[in-house]
């Protein structure tokens, strides 16, 4: 004999000893019908704010308040936004690796320093993790260039830099 709880819709709960579909109480939800209980809705407070409010069929979704970003599945925690010279990774904010920079506050990824030699120019000011290199005026006489291979932290990928 089929249990009538099997016919219950999401947003309801049903107990086998009294197989009647009942609506989820306030601040609870059930995304699958026929369950014996509804789940308690997530509350977004403190560093969290509501991205999506709870309904009888779906849990609430949280996001982080201004100046913070989510970490972990379903935004389980909030971390302060990255500073210039850093980029966001799963592990949180990491300093830009050698040969890259990020001049943005809170967003963006580390990007490579400009290769001045592509435009036939010399490096006037070397780059930092927060600032790109500053290229000088075009070089008139080209001396042989030396290629320095800079390996990004932790990996075999080389960043090709030209020193003139």
């Amino acid at each position: 004999v089929q249990n009538s709880c099997d016919n219950c819709q999401p947003g309801t709960f049903c107990r086998k000893y009294n197989p009647v579909c009942k609506s989820c109480p306030p601040s609870t939800f059930s995304s699958i019908g026929g369950q014996p209980n509804c789940n308690i809705c997530r509350v977004c407070a403190g560093y969290f704010r509501f991205k999506k409010f709870c309904s009888s069929t779906h849990n609430a979704e949280c996001e982080c308040i201004e100046g913070f970003h989510c970490l972990g599945p379903q935004c389980t925690r909030c971390e302060k936004d990255c500073r210039p010279g850093q980029e966001l990774t799963k592990q949180g904010c990491k300093t830009c690796s050698l040969g890259t920079f990020n001049d943005q506050n809170g967003t963006g990824v580390c990007r490579p320093w400009t290769n001045c030699s592509l435009d036939g120019r010399s490096v006037l000011k070397t780059g930092t993790t927060e600032k790109d290199v500053v290229c000088g005026p075009p070089v008139v006489s080209f001396s042989p260039s030396t290629t320095i291979s800079v390996t990004p932290e932790g990996g075999p990928g080389g960043h090709s830099l030209q020193v003139l």
Partner: antibody, heavy 121, light 111 residues
Framework: EVQLVESGGGLVQPGGSLRLSCAAS????????IYWVRQAPGKGLEWIGN????????FYGEKFMGRATFSADTSKNTAYLQMNSLRAEDTAVYYC??????????????WGQGTLVTVSS | SVELTQPPSVSVSPGQTARITCKLN????????VHWYQQKPGQAPVTMIY?????PDGIPERFSGSSDSSSNSAFLTISGVQAEDEADYYC??????????FGGGTKLTVL
Amino acid sequence: EVQLVESGGGLVQPGGSLRLSCAASGYTFTSYYIYWVRQAPGKGLEWIGNIWPGNGGTFYGEKFMGRATFSADTSKNTAYLQMNSLRAEDTAVYYCARRPDYSGDDYFDYWGQGTLVTVSS
Amino acid sequence: SVELTQPPSVSVSPGQTARITCKLNSGNIGSYYVHWYQQKPGQAPVTMIYRDDKRPDGIPERFSGSSDSSSNSAFLTISGVQAEDEADYYCHSYDSTITPVFGGGTKLTVL
């Protein structure tokens, strides 16, 4: 709609070179990394390197240093891969892909259709 | 350096659940985002799961991503497998934020 369209593949003699194009549209070309990835017949995906079109900055996989060169023409929203001294083992489908600006360890959200390069005499 | 290991093949009957493993050789799986791509013959890869467990628009709910710290592995789970799911699946992470690393790929066969 974001699109990456590749061209330039074909038959190349051993020792020869290739120049592949990756034409981007539907987004700000200078604000996203373009990665180059290849796939030999029946094999997995292999990273060649990547370029930041905004300033021409490049990174190369160790295996491809000195043999591959990336460039970008921002007026044409196109990235290029030049590869020299080609060998039979360079026969592969070459893909360009875009990485979002969310995090440093993010996925590739758009891929080109791929272009087949065959190195053979 | 970081390496990702996948089984070469997984077979499953239609309607069953397929689970593809991506094992990290060093470090902690919880420290790395893992992304999953599906590739059918003659086509470019398509993102199925990104940032561990997120599904792009248009990808069926049958596809889900997870990880397990005890086995240091990430998983792509396909519930209610359909014939059209037959393809190669690749996991993807990073050795550094510059250097992407791919698993060797898993061929999913729907019996």
